[in-house]
Interface confidence: low
């Protein structure tokens, strides 16, 4: 037989909390246990499931777990079945809801002196106890003509008056817990004695010296008081006006009139209505003084015929916002057509040359009017007045190439030389009329030149060839003073160029003929063997038919070129001793000797007491020091040539004699001993 050791029993449970219905059986064979709810088998879910033979609830649900539970045990072998006693939950719960108007049927029907009933839709088990609040303050039974039933969920206001106006809320509690209304109810009952707005003042914008009117009206029973205040809380009445509001008038209907408005009158005006009861009602309005700023300047505009262009007029800052319109020749532009106004823009569709001229943007508001002109030019393609022509320009002189064009606007002219853009520098200058000036024409300026004249409408171009008329000149000019080495072969070149190849010849300056050992070979004067008599003045003459002749004078000097008789040698000297560096040179004219030591010329007048240069050119240095070491260069020069030779000077410490060295042993290097 199946015996229930533990049977489920009815019990209290809390909504959403855990619970357990126990069931334990004893039987000889295998027993299958399951549960019924109101006679129907219970299916396991994550929330409600069998645990052994008991039924476990993870979270009791007042809707799904209401009813009668029964534990059923069945012996699958014998078919015997036993059922437990019935068990159910007494589920405790509470759930928030809104405050709603129960009576009258709609808010529109609420009138002073009528009964108003509000219902608190908080539900629960066991039945909750309710508490009502107005504007957060608890209400008690019989308070200020309310009839409040705590047991019931209704709040009755009998009769309802303006003093009952406010935000109503409710809270409720029971054995489960507490909840407050999810949505509250605002009760608004008008009080005839409260000031109510009939007409509110509006912001106004007025021009200086004009008048401004603010309207303001309230209603109440009995009639309310009305007062005007200016920004600084100064009251405005017809009897006592503040100094800056001398021209203010308050009318019986509440309107405020300000005449001859000044900047100091601008600001916030407050109209205050006060009923017999209730708070003051404050209305604000601002008086703005109209203003308009200047308009920005327009840049002149250049357009091309046939195109569509727009010119935007930026309205000046102003209060109120200025209106904008365009005029041309004193006539306001239409809003459609070929030339028209669109918003703030001037639109020129398919521009014609006749559209050129002055267009005016106007802006105006209460404060006044502003205008700004824009000059519109319709560009034309340039036409020629004078094209550049092939020209012959003289070398060394300025040359001009003309490129004269006319168009609207004034064309821009650029020049190209061999397809390269000419940028203005010291040799090239482009005048305002387009003419190109080449300063100091050079042979290589002979090439192609092209000028391009442009406007936004298009460009024209033409080119011309420049031929440079070369001047007769020596290339290069002979040196005016030259030296020849005595008893040697010598040549003196002379060459020249011109429009025609020039003939070149040499002659002596005194007009005498050249000796037979001197030949003139195509401009080169050749001396087979220079003699003293060859010295003198010579003239190179270059000539051609069209340009005549030019002369270059050369003074030839015959000289014996410099040679060194004595050259300085590599020298080593003991510190504190005297060094002698010898140098002698010969030549005609007699050469002068200079010394260079350690990369600087030794000035004989600034040598100091330790150094001296002899007449024959030798350099002596007394009391030598290590810093005197270095390379010394002897430089010999005359009017015809210059030669140099160098030698190093070493300054060393005097060695202490060693015993191994015999007396009078020579030093290991060549010394000057003094």
């Amino acid at each position: 037989a199946i015996v229930f050791i533990k049977q489920p029993s009815s019990q209290d449970a809390l909504q959403g909390r855990r619970a357990l219905l126990r069931c334990e059986v004893e039987a000889p064979g295998l027993v299958h246990v399951y549960w019924l709810l109101d006679g129907a088998p219970v299916q396991d879910t994550e929330r409600r499931f069998t645990q052994g033979s008991s039924l476990s609830f993870a979270a009791v649900d007042r809707l799904q777990d209401s009813g009668t539970f029964q534990c059923v045990a069945r012996d699958d072998v014998t078919g015997e079945e036993a059922r437990s006693a019935n068990a159910s939950f007494n589920i405790k719960w509470i759930e928030a809801g809104p405050v709603v108007l129960k009576h009258p049927a709609s808010e529109a029907e609420i009138q002073p002196q009528t009964q108003v009933t509000l219902r608190c839709h908080i539900d629960g088990h066991p039945r909750p106890t309710y508490q009502w609040f107005r504007d957060g303050t608890p209400l008690s039974d019989g308070q200020s003509n309310n009839t409040v039933s705590s047991k019931e969920r209704n709040l009755t206001l009998r009769p309802a008056g303006p003093e009952h106006s406010g935000l109503y809320s409710c809270c409720a509690h029971n054995a489960f817990g507490q909840a407050c209304s999810s949505q509250n109810f605002t009760l608004s009952i008008a009080d005839e004695s409260f000031a109510r707005v009939v007409l509110a003042p509006q912001d106004v914008i007025v021009a200086r010296n004009e008048e401004a009117m603010f309207h303001c009206q309230f209603s109440a029973q009995p009639p309310p008081n009305l007062q005007w205040l200016f920004e600084d809380e100064t009251p405005i009445t017809n009897r006592s006006r503040p100094p800056h509001l001398r021209r203010a008038t308050v009318f019986a209907n509440g309107s405020l009139l300000l005449t001859q408005v000044r900047p100091r009158n601008a600001g916030v005006y407050r109209c205050i209505g006060q009923g017999q009861r209730g708070p003051p009602v404050i209305l604000e309005a601002t008086l703005h003084l109209a203003e308009i700023e200047d308009m920005p300047l327009f840049e002149p505009r250049v357009f091309t015929a046939g195109s569509e262009e727009r010119v935007t007029c930026l309205p000046p800052k102003g209060l109120p916002e200025p209106s904008v319109w365009w005029e041309h020749a004193g006539v306001r532009l239409p809003t459609h057509g070929r030339v028209y106004q669109k918003g703030h823009e001037l639109v020129l569709a398919s521009i014609a040359e006749s559209d050129a001229g002055v267009y005016t943007c106007h802006a105006a508001n209460l404060a006044g009017q502003r205008r700004q002109d824009v000059n519109i030019t319709v560009a034309t393609v340039p036409t020629w007045l004078k094209k550049p022509q092939d020209s012959q320009l003289e070398e060394g002189k300025p040359g001009y190439l003309h490129c004269l064009t006319q168009a609207t606007p004034k064309p821009t002219v650029v020049w190209y030389r061999n397809q390269m853009l000419i940028s203005e520098d010291s040799r090239f200058e482009v005048f305002k009329n387009g003419t190109l000036r080449i300063n100091n024409v050079e042979v290589y300026d002979g090439t192609w030149y092209r000028c391009v004249s442009s406007t936004p409408a298009g460009s024209i171009e033409a080119q011309a060839r420049v031929q440079v008329l070369e001047k007769l000149k020596f290339t290069p000019p002979p040196q005016p003073q030259q030296c020849m080495e005595f008893d040697k072969e010598a040549t003196v070149p002379c060459s020249a160029t011109g429009r025609e190849k020039p003939t070149i010849k040499w002659e002596r300056a005194d007009g005498s003929s050249l000796p037979e050992w001197v030949t003139d070979n195509a401009g080169t004067l050749h001396f087979a063997r220079v003699t003293r008599d060859d010295a003198g003045n010579y003239t190179c003459i270059a000539s051609n038919g069209p340009q005549g002749q030019i002369r270059a004078h050369v003074q030839l000097t015959v000289a014996v070129f410099i040679t060194f008789k004595v050259e300085p040698e590599r020298t080593t000297v003991y510190q504190g001793h005297t060094a002698l560096l010898q140098c002698e040179a010969q030549g005609d004219p007699k050469p002068l000797i200079q010394w260079k030591g350690k990369d600087r010329i030794l000035d004989p007048t600034k040598l100091g007491p330790r150094m001296h240069i002899f007449q024959n050119g030798s350099l002596v240095i007394h009391d030598v020091a290590p810093e005197d070491s270095g390379r010394y260069t002897c430089i010999a020069g005359n009017s015809c040539n210059i030669k140099h030779t160098e030698a190093p000077l070493y300054v060393v410490d005097k060695p202490v004699p060693e015993e191994s060295e015999g007396p009078g042993s020579p030093p290991p290097y060549k010394m000057i001993q003094t």
Epitope: R301, P409, P411, T412, L421, P456, S459
Partner: nanobody, 124 residues
Framework: QVQLQESGGGLVQPGGSLTLACAAS????????MRWVRQAPGKGLEGVSS????????YYADFAKGRFTISRDNAKNTLYLQLNSLKTEDTAMYYC?????????????????VGQGTQVTVSS
């Protein structure tokens, strides 16, 4: 001394793209409108596009509209021209040019000084 150095040209097939750049020095680049001009073989200079000093206004010749884009980087003193959907008739030497301080739109073409130019060749 105003110096303008163009780069970025080259040989490209019809329908291809290139970006030209122009490095500017010797003047207050960010205060001036800038423009691109071009010269086709055997033809005169023609305006391509221009841009205001701040880069907020751009203008294009009819042939350039929808295909070319002008821009500038005032921090790098550099002007750019993006060439898309290139045609054989776009073959030309492209120069960048300094405009004036005011309108990028209405100054006359061409504007000097200009640089040495960069060659754009469109050929199949």
């Amino acid at each position: 001394q105003v110096q303008l150095q163009e780069s970025g040209g080259g040989l490209v097939q019809p329908g291809g793209s290139l970006t030209l750049a122009c490095a500017a020095s010797g003047f207050a680049f960010s205060s001036y409108a800038m423009r691109w001009v071009r010269q086709a073989p055997g033809k005169g200079l023609e305006g391509v596009s221009s841009i205001s000093a701040g880069g907020d206004e751009t203008y294009y010749a009819d042939f350039a509209k929808g295909r070319f884009t002008i821009s500038r980087d005032n921090a790098k003193n550099t002007l750019y021209l993006q060439l898309n959907s290139l045609k054989t008739e776009d073959t030309a030497m492209y120069y960048c040019a300094k405009g004036d301080r005011n309108s990028p739109r209405y100054s006359s073409w061409p504007i000097t000084p200009v640089g040495q130019g960069t060659q754009v060749t469109v050929s199949s």
